[in-house]
Interface confidence: low
Protein backbone atom coordinates (compact mmCIF):
# COMPACT_ATOMS: atom_id res chain seq x y z
CA UNK A 1 0.00 0.00 0.00
CA UNK A 2 0.77 3.55 -0.68
CA UNK A 3 1.15 5.57 2.00
CA UNK A 4 3.60 8.26 1.19
CA UNK A 5 2.20 12.03 0.24
CA UNK A 6 3.28 14.69 -2.27
CA UNK A 7 4.25 18.42 -1.03
CA UNK A 8 4.78 20.74 -3.73
CA UNK A 9 4.83 24.78 -4.21
CA UNK A 10 1.41 24.30 -5.63
CA UNK A 11 0.23 27.15 -7.65
CA UNK A 12 3.04 30.03 -8.15
CA UNK A 13 3.72 32.65 -10.43
CA UNK A 14 6.86 34.85 -11.56
CA UNK A 15 8.01 37.58 -13.59
CA UNK A 16 8.68 37.12 -17.62
CA UNK A 17 12.63 36.83 -17.54
CA UNK A 18 12.86 35.74 -13.97
CA UNK A 19 13.92 32.60 -12.06
CA UNK A 20 11.36 30.32 -9.96
CA UNK A 21 12.53 27.37 -8.28
CA UNK A 22 10.12 23.97 -8.29
CA UNK A 23 9.78 21.94 -5.48
CA UNK A 24 8.23 18.69 -4.51
CA UNK A 25 8.68 16.84 -1.15
CA UNK A 26 7.55 13.23 -0.61
CA UNK A 27 6.54 12.40 3.31
CA UNK A 28 5.06 9.68 5.04
CA UNK A 29 6.71 7.15 3.63
CA UNK A 30 9.87 4.65 4.22
CA UNK A 31 10.30 3.69 0.26
CA UNK A 32 13.39 4.80 -1.03
CA UNK A 33 13.40 7.81 -3.84
CA UNK A 34 15.32 5.96 -6.63
CA UNK A 35 14.65 8.78 -9.23
CA UNK A 36 12.85 12.02 -9.64
CA UNK A 37 11.66 13.09 -13.12
CA UNK A 38 10.82 16.46 -13.59
CA UNK A 39 8.17 17.28 -16.80
CA UNK A 40 6.14 19.91 -18.07
CA UNK A 41 2.92 18.30 -20.00
CA UNK A 42 4.87 15.89 -22.03
CA UNK A 43 7.96 16.85 -22.21
CA UNK A 44 10.87 16.10 -19.96
CA UNK A 45 13.27 18.34 -18.20
CA UNK A 46 14.98 16.75 -16.17
CA UNK A 47 16.36 13.35 -14.18
CA UNK A 48 17.53 13.46 -10.66
CA UNK A 49 18.50 9.86 -10.05
CA UNK A 50 19.90 8.38 -6.82
CA UNK A 51 23.03 6.60 -8.38
CA UNK A 52 23.79 8.70 -11.35
CA UNK A 53 22.76 11.98 -10.70
CA UNK A 54 21.09 14.51 -12.64
CA UNK A 55 20.45 14.77 -16.34
CA UNK A 56 18.90 18.23 -17.70
CA UNK A 57 17.49 17.56 -21.16
CA UNK A 58 19.07 19.16 -24.02
CA UNK A 59 16.95 21.73 -25.35
CA UNK A 60 16.29 22.43 -21.67
CA UNK A 61 20.38 22.71 -20.59
CA UNK A 62 20.45 26.27 -20.89
CA UNK A 63 17.68 27.45 -19.01
CA UNK A 64 16.89 24.69 -16.30
CA UNK A 65 19.17 24.08 -12.85
CA UNK A 66 19.41 20.82 -11.06
CA UNK A 67 18.13 21.54 -7.34
CA UNK A 68 18.42 22.68 -4.51
CA UNK A 69 18.07 19.25 -3.77
CA UNK A 70 15.33 17.39 -5.69
CA UNK A 71 13.82 20.48 -6.92
CA UNK A 72 14.41 22.07 -10.49
CA UNK A 73 15.41 25.93 -11.01
CA UNK A 74 13.92 27.28 -14.01
CA UNK A 75 15.63 30.11 -15.53
CA UNK A 76 15.16 33.39 -18.21
CA UNK A 77 11.47 32.96 -17.81
CA UNK A 78 9.35 33.27 -20.70
CA UNK A 79 4.93 33.81 -21.05
CA UNK A 80 5.48 30.05 -22.72
CA UNK A 81 7.20 28.58 -19.72
CA UNK A 82 3.36 29.29 -18.04
CA UNK A 83 1.42 25.58 -17.65
CA UNK A 84 1.59 22.12 -16.18
CA UNK A 85 4.92 20.91 -14.25
CA UNK A 86 5.11 17.52 -12.78
CA UNK A 87 7.46 15.74 -10.33
CA UNK A 88 7.70 12.31 -10.21
CA UNK A 89 8.99 10.42 -7.35
CA UNK A 90 10.31 6.45 -8.78
CA UNK A 91 9.93 4.71 -5.13
CA UNK A 92 10.61 0.95 -4.11
CA UNK A 93 9.15 -0.87 -2.91
CA UNK A 94 5.94 1.72 -3.57
CA UNK A 95 5.94 2.55 -7.31
CA UNK A 96 5.08 6.13 -8.29
CA UNK A 97 4.04 9.21 -6.55
CA UNK A 98 3.29 12.62 -8.84
CA UNK A 99 2.91 16.34 -7.59
CA UNK A 100 2.03 19.03 -9.90
CA UNK A 101 2.45 22.71 -9.96
CA UNK A 102 0.88 25.43 -11.91
CA UNK A 103 3.09 27.83 -13.05
CA UNK A 104 1.66 31.21 -14.45
CA UNK A 105 4.71 33.62 -16.12
CA UNK A 106 3.54 37.10 -15.55
CA UNK A 107 4.48 40.08 -17.91
CA UNK A 108 3.86 42.59 -15.26
CA UNK A 109 5.87 42.74 -11.59
CA UNK A 110 2.76 41.13 -9.77
CA UNK A 111 3.86 37.93 -9.05
CA UNK A 112 2.55 36.15 -5.41
CA UNK A 113 3.00 32.97 -4.73
CA UNK A 114 0.74 30.24 -3.99
CA UNK A 115 -0.35 27.93 -1.03
CA UNK A 116 1.34 24.97 -0.66
CA UNK A 117 -0.69 22.00 -1.02
CA UNK A 118 -0.68 17.83 -1.11
CA UNK A 119 -1.29 14.95 -3.28
CA UNK A 120 -1.76 11.65 -1.68
CA UNK B 1 27.22 10.29 -33.71
CA UNK B 2 27.77 8.46 -30.24
CA UNK B 3 30.46 5.89 -30.46
CA UNK B 4 31.96 3.54 -27.33
CA UNK B 5 34.94 1.72 -28.29
CA UNK B 6 36.06 -0.80 -26.18
CA UNK B 7 40.01 -2.23 -25.75
CA UNK B 8 40.89 -4.92 -27.71
CA UNK B 9 40.94 -9.21 -25.90
CA UNK B 10 42.54 -10.11 -23.09
CA UNK B 11 43.51 -13.84 -22.35
CA UNK B 12 44.30 -13.85 -18.24
CA UNK B 13 45.33 -16.60 -15.60
CA UNK B 14 42.91 -17.88 -12.89
CA UNK B 15 43.51 -15.12 -10.08
CA UNK B 16 44.93 -12.51 -12.23
CA UNK B 17 42.70 -9.22 -13.02
CA UNK B 18 41.85 -7.25 -15.89
CA UNK B 19 40.67 -3.97 -16.84
CA UNK B 20 38.69 -2.99 -20.01
CA UNK B 21 38.62 0.51 -21.05
CA UNK B 22 35.44 2.03 -23.09
CA UNK B 23 35.81 5.39 -24.82
CA UNK B 24 33.09 7.39 -25.19
CA UNK B 25 32.26 9.97 -28.13
CA UNK B 26 29.52 11.85 -30.11
CA UNK B 27 27.76 13.05 -26.22
CA UNK B 28 29.03 14.95 -23.75
CA UNK B 29 30.72 12.23 -21.86
CA UNK B 30 29.39 13.24 -17.71
CA UNK B 31 25.52 13.85 -18.70
CA UNK B 32 25.22 9.82 -18.95
CA UNK B 33 26.46 7.02 -17.38
CA UNK B 34 28.07 3.85 -18.21
CA UNK B 35 26.51 0.46 -17.30
CA UNK B 36 28.79 -2.49 -17.57
CA UNK B 37 27.17 -6.19 -19.09
CA UNK B 38 28.24 -9.49 -19.79
CA UNK B 39 28.04 -12.64 -21.63
CA UNK B 40 29.64 -16.06 -20.78
CA UNK B 41 30.05 -18.00 -24.44
CA UNK B 42 26.19 -19.36 -25.23
CA UNK B 43 24.75 -17.63 -22.22
CA UNK B 44 22.46 -14.23 -21.75
CA UNK B 45 23.24 -10.95 -20.44
CA UNK B 46 24.58 -10.72 -17.14
CA UNK B 47 24.48 -6.82 -15.54
CA UNK B 48 28.14 -6.25 -13.75
CA UNK B 49 27.46 -2.55 -12.46
CA UNK B 50 27.39 1.30 -13.70
CA UNK B 51 29.15 4.53 -12.85
CA UNK B 52 28.19 7.73 -13.03
CA UNK B 53 30.27 9.77 -15.05
CA UNK B 54 28.70 12.82 -13.66
CA UNK B 55 29.84 12.53 -10.41
CA UNK B 56 31.54 9.04 -9.72
CA UNK B 57 29.14 6.95 -7.72
CA UNK B 58 29.43 3.46 -8.59
CA UNK B 59 26.73 0.76 -8.26
CA UNK B 60 28.21 -3.12 -8.53
CA UNK B 61 25.91 -6.19 -9.05
CA UNK B 62 25.67 -7.92 -5.37
CA UNK B 63 27.56 -11.30 -6.56
CA UNK B 64 30.64 -9.36 -7.88
CA UNK B 65 31.15 -6.86 -5.01
CA UNK B 66 34.26 -6.52 -4.03
CA UNK B 67 36.31 -7.89 -7.41
CA UNK B 68 35.08 -5.26 -9.62
CA UNK B 69 36.20 -1.32 -9.37
CA UNK B 70 34.49 0.95 -12.43
CA UNK B 71 36.54 4.59 -13.04
CA UNK B 72 36.01 7.13 -15.47
CA UNK B 73 38.37 9.65 -16.68
CA UNK B 74 36.49 12.60 -17.67
CA UNK B 75 39.64 13.73 -19.74
CA UNK B 76 39.82 11.53 -22.05
CA UNK B 77 35.97 10.33 -22.13
CA UNK B 78 36.86 7.00 -20.99
CA UNK B 79 35.19 4.21 -18.79
CA UNK B 80 37.02 1.27 -16.89
CA UNK B 81 35.87 -1.82 -15.67
CA UNK B 82 38.81 -3.91 -13.60
CA UNK B 83 37.78 -7.67 -12.07
CA UNK B 84 40.03 -8.71 -10.58
CA UNK B 85 40.51 -12.44 -8.93
CA UNK B 86 39.52 -13.99 -12.51
CA UNK B 87 38.47 -17.46 -12.45
CA UNK B 88 37.15 -19.44 -15.64
CA UNK B 89 33.43 -18.69 -15.14
CA UNK B 90 34.84 -15.36 -15.85
CA UNK B 91 35.61 -15.81 -19.68
CA UNK B 92 32.94 -13.98 -21.17
CA UNK B 93 32.53 -10.88 -23.78
CA UNK B 94 32.39 -7.92 -21.60
CA UNK B 95 30.36 -4.94 -23.26
CA UNK B 96 30.26 -1.23 -21.96
CA UNK B 97 26.70 0.11 -22.44
CA UNK B 98 25.38 3.86 -21.99
CA UNK B 99 22.30 4.50 -19.74
CA UNK B 100 20.15 6.36 -21.58
CA UNK B 101 18.03 8.70 -19.36
CA UNK B 102 14.99 9.54 -22.09
CA UNK B 103 15.04 5.49 -22.63
CA UNK B 104 14.15 4.72 -18.52
CA UNK B 105 17.91 3.98 -17.84
CA UNK B 106 17.59 1.47 -21.30
CA UNK B 107 21.10 1.04 -22.50
CA UNK B 108 20.64 2.96 -25.59
CA UNK B 109 24.52 2.55 -27.26
CA UNK B 110 26.95 -0.27 -26.60
CA UNK B 111 30.61 -1.29 -27.09
CA UNK B 112 31.60 -3.47 -29.61
CA UNK B 113 32.10 -6.17 -27.12
CA UNK B 114 35.88 -7.13 -25.26
CA UNK B 115 36.54 -11.30 -25.21
CA UNK B 116 38.02 -12.27 -21.91
CA UNK B 117 39.06 -15.31 -21.65
CA UNK B 118 40.09 -16.82 -18.27
CA UNK B 119 42.06 -19.78 -18.47
CA UNK B 120 45.35 -21.86 -17.03
CA UNK C 1 16.64 -9.11 -6.84
CA UNK C 2 13.66 -8.59 -9.31
CA UNK C 3 13.51 -11.51 -11.67
CA UNK C 4 12.06 -11.95 -15.08
CA UNK C 5 11.07 -14.78 -17.05
CA UNK C 6 10.40 -14.45 -20.83
CA UNK C 7 8.59 -17.28 -22.68
CA UNK C 8 9.14 -18.98 -24.81
CA UNK C 9 12.53 -19.43 -24.41
CA UNK C 10 12.77 -20.51 -28.42
CA UNK C 11 10.28 -20.21 -31.35
CA UNK C 12 10.60 -21.19 -35.31
CA UNK C 13 8.42 -18.74 -37.19
CA UNK C 14 8.51 -17.83 -41.16
CA UNK C 15 8.98 -14.57 -42.72
CA UNK C 16 6.03 -13.20 -42.49
CA UNK C 17 4.40 -14.48 -39.40
CA UNK C 18 3.16 -12.31 -36.15
CA UNK C 19 5.16 -13.25 -33.40
CA UNK C 20 4.89 -12.10 -29.52
CA UNK C 21 7.45 -12.41 -26.75
CA UNK C 22 6.64 -12.01 -23.42
CA UNK C 23 8.28 -11.11 -20.39
CA UNK C 24 7.36 -11.62 -16.55
CA UNK C 25 8.14 -9.53 -13.69
CA UNK C 26 8.25 -11.20 -10.07
CA UNK C 27 6.98 -7.90 -8.77
CA UNK C 28 5.67 -4.99 -10.51
CA UNK C 29 8.03 -2.83 -12.27
CA UNK C 30 5.50 -0.07 -13.46
CA UNK C 31 6.86 0.36 -17.01
CA UNK C 32 10.40 0.44 -16.25
CA UNK C 33 11.14 -2.65 -19.18
CA UNK C 34 13.35 -2.77 -21.88
CA UNK C 35 13.76 -5.15 -25.25
CA UNK C 36 16.34 -5.71 -26.76
CA UNK C 37 17.92 -7.76 -30.27
CA UNK C 38 20.98 -9.46 -30.41
CA UNK C 39 22.22 -11.43 -33.14
CA UNK C 40 25.85 -13.61 -33.08
CA UNK C 41 28.56 -11.88 -32.63
CA UNK C 42 27.56 -8.51 -31.97
CA UNK C 43 26.36 -6.56 -29.61
CA UNK C 44 22.27 -5.98 -27.96
CA UNK C 45 20.46 -3.63 -29.77
CA UNK C 46 17.52 -1.50 -27.71
CA UNK C 47 14.58 -1.65 -29.73
CA UNK C 48 11.93 -0.58 -26.98
CA UNK C 49 12.06 1.28 -23.58
CA UNK C 50 9.70 2.28 -21.23
CA UNK C 51 7.84 -1.02 -21.78
CA UNK C 52 6.35 0.69 -25.52
CA UNK C 53 8.20 3.58 -26.75
CA UNK C 54 9.96 2.39 -29.79
CA UNK C 55 13.78 3.43 -29.94
CA UNK C 56 14.62 6.08 -32.73
CA UNK C 57 15.97 4.01 -35.93
CA UNK C 58 13.88 0.79 -35.01
CA UNK C 59 11.88 0.02 -37.52
CA UNK C 60 7.48 0.01 -36.88
CA UNK C 61 7.22 -3.77 -37.10
CA UNK C 62 8.10 -3.82 -33.53
CA UNK C 63 6.06 -3.24 -30.35
CA UNK C 64 6.00 -2.94 -26.73
CA UNK C 65 3.22 -3.60 -24.55
CA UNK C 66 2.48 -4.13 -21.06
CA UNK C 67 2.59 -2.57 -17.29
CA UNK C 68 3.24 -3.91 -13.83
CA UNK C 69 4.61 -7.60 -14.22
CA UNK C 70 3.32 -8.78 -17.60
CA UNK C 71 5.09 -7.56 -20.38
CA UNK C 72 4.95 -8.17 -25.08
CA UNK C 73 7.24 -7.36 -27.62
CA UNK C 74 5.47 -8.02 -30.91
CA UNK C 75 6.78 -8.34 -34.49
CA UNK C 76 3.96 -7.46 -36.67
CA UNK C 77 5.40 -9.25 -39.42
CA UNK C 78 8.78 -10.76 -39.37
CA UNK C 79 11.74 -10.17 -41.87
CA UNK C 80 14.62 -11.93 -42.36
CA UNK C 81 16.88 -9.50 -40.63
CA UNK C 82 14.76 -10.25 -37.44
CA UNK C 83 16.39 -13.60 -36.70
CA UNK C 84 17.59 -13.22 -33.13
CA UNK C 85 18.24 -13.64 -29.64
CA UNK C 86 15.67 -11.29 -27.94
CA UNK C 87 15.89 -9.93 -24.17
CA UNK C 88 13.97 -8.00 -21.91
CA UNK C 89 15.62 -6.01 -18.80
CA UNK C 90 13.83 -4.38 -16.20
CA UNK C 91 15.38 -0.73 -14.96
CA UNK C 92 12.82 -0.41 -12.14
CA UNK C 93 15.44 -1.60 -9.38
CA UNK C 94 18.24 0.89 -10.08
CA UNK C 95 20.32 -1.00 -7.61
CA UNK C 96 20.20 -4.43 -9.69
CA UNK C 97 19.49 -4.24 -12.98
CA UNK C 98 18.43 -7.58 -14.09
CA UNK C 99 17.48 -9.31 -17.72
CA UNK C 100 15.45 -11.71 -18.73
CA UNK C 101 16.82 -15.13 -19.85
CA UNK C 102 16.37 -14.71 -23.49
CA UNK C 103 14.19 -16.01 -26.57
CA UNK C 104 15.68 -17.60 -29.75
CA UNK C 105 13.79 -16.76 -32.58
CA UNK C 106 14.50 -18.84 -35.40
CA UNK C 107 13.21 -19.49 -39.17
CA UNK C 108 10.65 -22.16 -39.68
Known amino acids: MMTGTIETTGNISAEKGGSIILQCHLSSTTAQVTQVNWEQQDQLLAICNADLGWHISPSFKDRVAPGPGLGLTLQSLTVNDTGEYFCIYHTYPDGTYTGRIFLEVLESSVAEHGARFQIP | QVQLVQSGAEVKKPGASVKVSCKASGYTFTSYGISWVRQAPGQGLEWMGW????????NYAQKLQGRVTMTTDTSTSTAYMELRSLRSDDTAVYYC?????????????WGQGTLVTVSS | AIQLTQSPSSLSASVGDRVTITCRAS??????LNWYQQKPGKAPKLLIY???SLQSGVPSRFSGSGSGTDFTLTISSLQPEDFATYYC??????????FGQGTRLEIK
Open chain 2, 97 to 109: ARAGWEQQLGFDY
Open chain 3, 27 to 32: QSISSY
Open chain 3, 50 to 52: AAS
Open chain 2, 51 to 58: ISAYNGNT
Open chain 3, 89 to 98: QQSYSTLAIT
